[in-house]
């Protein structure tokens, strides 16, 4: 999906209002310095591409993020403010349903959510030069 035509300011507002709080809740009890940010993004469409991938695509050691509260709200925000987004997700969701595992918060998931927090922070500061 090409995130170029999304309403970035509304997605940012939704993130600041509630999605960010849900990410913090998920990470509660984890030190903010525990994980190094290894995933980066260069502009807002790129950031949303990476956020979409880390939130909804199962990875080795972390198959369960798509059912978390922050993921549900992320999906809602992208569907509402990115034209045509919800239609592109049908095949991805069917595939994910087949692979879905029991919900377990592993260290790998905590690391992945830490990366997500970094991507969202970068999304919110689009004018910053890439590190």
């Amino acid at each position: 999906y090409d995130f170029t035509n999304c309403d970035f300011e509304k997605i940012k507002a939704a993130y600041l209002s509630t999605i960010s709080k849900d990410l913090i809740t998920y990470m509660s009890g984890t030190k903010s310095t525990e994980f190094n940010n290894t995933v980066s993004c260069s502009n807002r469409p790129h950031c949303l591409t990476e956020i979409q991938s880390l939130t909804f695509n199962p990875t080795a050691g972390c198959a369960s993020l798509a059912k978390e509260m922050f993921a549900m709200k992320t999906k809602a925000a992208l569907a509402i403010w990115c034209p045509g987004y919800s239609e592109t997700q049908i095949n991805a969701t069917q595939a994910m349903k087949k692979r879905r595992k029991r919900k377990v918060t592993t260290n790998k998931c905590l690391e992945q959510v830490s990366q997500l927090q970094g991507l969202w922070r970068r999304f919110n500061r689009p004018l910053l030069k890439q590190q």
Epitope: S17, T18, K75, A76, I80, S86, I90
Partner: antibody, heavy 122, light 108 residues
Framework: QVQLQQSGAELVRPGSSVKISCKSS????????MNWVKQRPGQGLEWIGQ????????TYNGNFKGKTTLTADKSSNTAYMQLSSLTSEDSAVYFC???????????????WGQGTSVTVSS | EIVLTQSPTLMAASPGEKVTITCSVS???????LHWYQQKSETSPKPWIF???NLASGVPVRFSGSGSGTSYSLTISNMEAEDAATYYC?????????FGAGTKLELK
């Protein structure tokens, strides 16, 4: 304007099934999660689950797994909830409720259907 | 699951009286995830207060909400007849979504 129109009251036999509908208009149906909420007579509200019509993704309250099945038909902008193996405990009013970001970007159930009464009786 | 405990369950207030309804949450949640709904008999619930303190469209300014962590409240500064209803708090912090049992507010 956003409207959620639910199907009419149902009187059903114990052990049978019932499917109630919630027809949406005035917004992009595929892009918003749809919730279902149960209210027994004189009681409070109980969340059953939700469906994302765009891809059929669902999340259920564990108390209702096996009892309810949520589906959505994008061609008619309609969400459905099927209740199976009905008992007197299932007699209630069932509401559909869209969830979205309000003007302050808080996420909540912002529009509700008028409710469908289901009475289970022999 | 997160349990929301409302108090009182039932109360009556005279016109002009100040009313406070509380919602105690079993584990701490972000204030952005606590909402209030109003329901009058035989009708569907209406969104009333979003994110602890933000009034929904059309809600009179005599209503206010406050709180954080595990303790939240809805206040009516001057009770009016049209405020007689049942009020529910609800959390959107974790699954399953849960509601308080409701506070029925009657006109004295």
């Amino acid at each position: 304007q956003v409207q959620l129109q639910q199907s009419g009251a149902e009187l059903v036999r114990p052990g049978s099934s019932v499917k109630i509908s919630c027809k949406s208009s005035g917004y992009a149906f595929s892009s918003y999660w749809m919730n279902w909420v149960k209210q027994r007579p004189g009681q409070g509200l109980e969340w059953i689950g939700q469906i994302f019509p765009g891809d059929g993704d669902t999340t259920y309250n564990g108390n209702f797994k096996g009892k309810t099945t949520l589906t959505a038909d994008k061609s008619s902008n309609t969400a459905y909830m099927q209740l199976s193996s009905l008992t007197s405990e299932d007699s209630a009013v069932y509401f559909c409720a869209r969830s979205g970001f309000d003007y302050g970007y808080f996420y909540a159930m912002d529009y509700w259907g008028q409710g469908t009464s289901v009475t289970v009786s022999s | 699951e997160i349990v929301l405990t409302q108090s009182p369950t039932l109360m009556a207030a005279s016109p002009g009286e100040k009313v406070t309804i509380t919602c105690s949450v079993s584990s701490s949640i972000s204030s952005s995830n606590l909402h209030w709904y109003q329901q009058k008999s035989e009708t569907s619930p209406k969104p009333w207060i979003f994110g602890t303190s933000n009034l929904a469209s059309g809600v009179p300014v005599r209503f206010s909400g406050s709180g954080s962590g595990t303790s939240y409240s809805l206040t009516i500064s001057n009770m009016e007849a049209e405020d007689a209803a049942t009020y529910y708090c609800q959390q959107w912090s974790s699954y399953p979504l849960t509601f308080g049992a409701g506070t029925k507010l009657e006109l004295k």
